[in-house]
């Protein structure tokens, strides 16, 4: 049967993003409509047809355009994605003979981790804090020269859609740690990044 091929995309916040749909059919459509999927009913964003060209709905006027003007292959581009743009989008190819044939492409927005790593001595112990803020939520691990060191982790969700993960390494005998390297590892979207800290006696 006739189908539409799509691909989900993940793009960085405040960068452009494109979603593409391809109608796997011998014939082009009469009109292509892009809609954003919403809880109640989909919202029309833009249409393209030979008769009327590109028609962008007012709410999307400065946000998107159709960058591949095709009736078999259609691409929409968001100029500068925000968190509100995350979600799934439907492309509807209204074809002669077979009606509306739809595909769904989903857009995920990510924010690269911002990491801070610092330490603090007190009389009898040392706290090393590693904090990573990103979207989706990052994971924080420690690589230390010896085992048996405790850590505690706190996760905080922010209104802007990012999540901060803060892990504190509690070292009971700080003298042994002086001059040694501690590594905070941040895992985000399948990539691990090392942040190194050498402890010096203040």
């Amino acid at each position: 049967q006739v189908q539409v091929v799509t691909q989900d995309e993940r793009e960085q916040l405040y960068t452009p993003a494109s979603l593409k749909c391809s109608l796997q059919n011998a014939q082009e459509a009469l009109i292509v409509t892009w809609q954003k999927k919403k809880a109640v009913s989909p919202e029309n964003m833009v249409t393209f047809s030979e008769n009327h060209g590109v028609v962008i709905q007012p709410a999307y006027k400065d946000k998107i355009n159709i960058t591949q003007l095709g009736l078999q292959n259609s691409t929409i581009t968001f100029w500068n994605i925000t968190l509100e743009d995350e979600g799934c989008y439907m492309c509807l190819f209204n074809t002669f003979g077979f009606g509306k044939i739809s595909g769904t492409a989903c857009l995920t927005v990510y924010v690269q981790p911002i990491v801070s790593l610092h330490y603090k001595f007190s009389e009898d112990h040392l706290n090393i804090t590693c904090s990573a803020t990103a979207r989706p939520a990052p994971m924080v691990f420690w690589k230390v020269p010896r085992s048996g060191i405790e850590n505690s982790t706190v996760t905080l969700s922010h209104p802007n859609g990012t999540t901060s993960v803060t892990s504190i390494l509690h070292i009971k005998d700080p003298k042994n740690q002086v001059g040694k390297e501690v590594i905070c590892q941040v895992l985000h979207l399948g990539t691990v990044t090392d942040f190194k800290q050498t402890v010096n006696k203040g």
Partner: antibody, heavy 117, light 107 residues
Framework: QVQLVQSGAEVKKPGASVKVSCKAS????????ILWVRQAPGQRLEWMGH????????NYNLKFKGRVTITRDTSASTAYMELSSLRSEDTAVYYC??????????WGQGTLVTVSS | DIQMTQSPSSLSASVGDRVTITCKAS??????LSWFQQKPGKAPKSLIY???RLVDGVPSRFSGSGSGTDFTLTISSLQPEDFGTYYC?????????FGQGTKLEIK
Amino acid sequence: QVQLVQSGAEVKKPGASVKVSCKASGYSFTDYIILWVRQAPGQRLEWMGHIDPYYGSSNYNLKFKGRVTITRDTSASTAYMELSSLRSEDTAVYYCGRSKRDYFDYWGQGTLVTVSS
Amino acid sequence: DIQMTQSPSSLSASVGDRVTITCKASQDINSYLSWFQQKPGKAPKSLIYRANRLVDGVPSRFSGSGSGTDFTLTISSLQPEDFGTYYCLQYDEFPYTFGQGTKLEIK
């Protein structure tokens, strides 16, 4: 040159089936939809259904309640329309045509099907 | 199903006359309408598609207009070969449906 050549006239008894062929030549068969319309004596044209030869996807007028089947043989560049459980009201001229989207340009010469006991 | 109603059902006109045939859909069909000419014992011939686009090879005296529910086929200057029955076809919604036809006779 482009041609759609239909099979010859048929006389059928009520309850029988008829299969009309439409042989295409002069173009790439899978690039155009093949449609079937019919016209009973003194009546308006009636859309029966169509097929996209590229995939073999077809769409039928539900008025025919599953009595119509449209198929194709790409190797022979031929489309077929089969109508079963024939009744006297099915006496008509059956036409095949081709379209690129909604652009209809060539038609077969028509096939008269007579249903009579 | 969408009903297509043509008017008039028949008309007689003279060579050189301007002839107008109308087609009314029972619901909005956007611009998804074609016009056909059919002569006795012959297959239909496409004249206009998407309400106002002329099919290649069709004389420019034929034109189509309208959108939504009301459509018109106009022959600006009738020629002797224009006799026959004219049908409109909607293809906005399946099943696609034809009008009942307008029989045009030359006076």
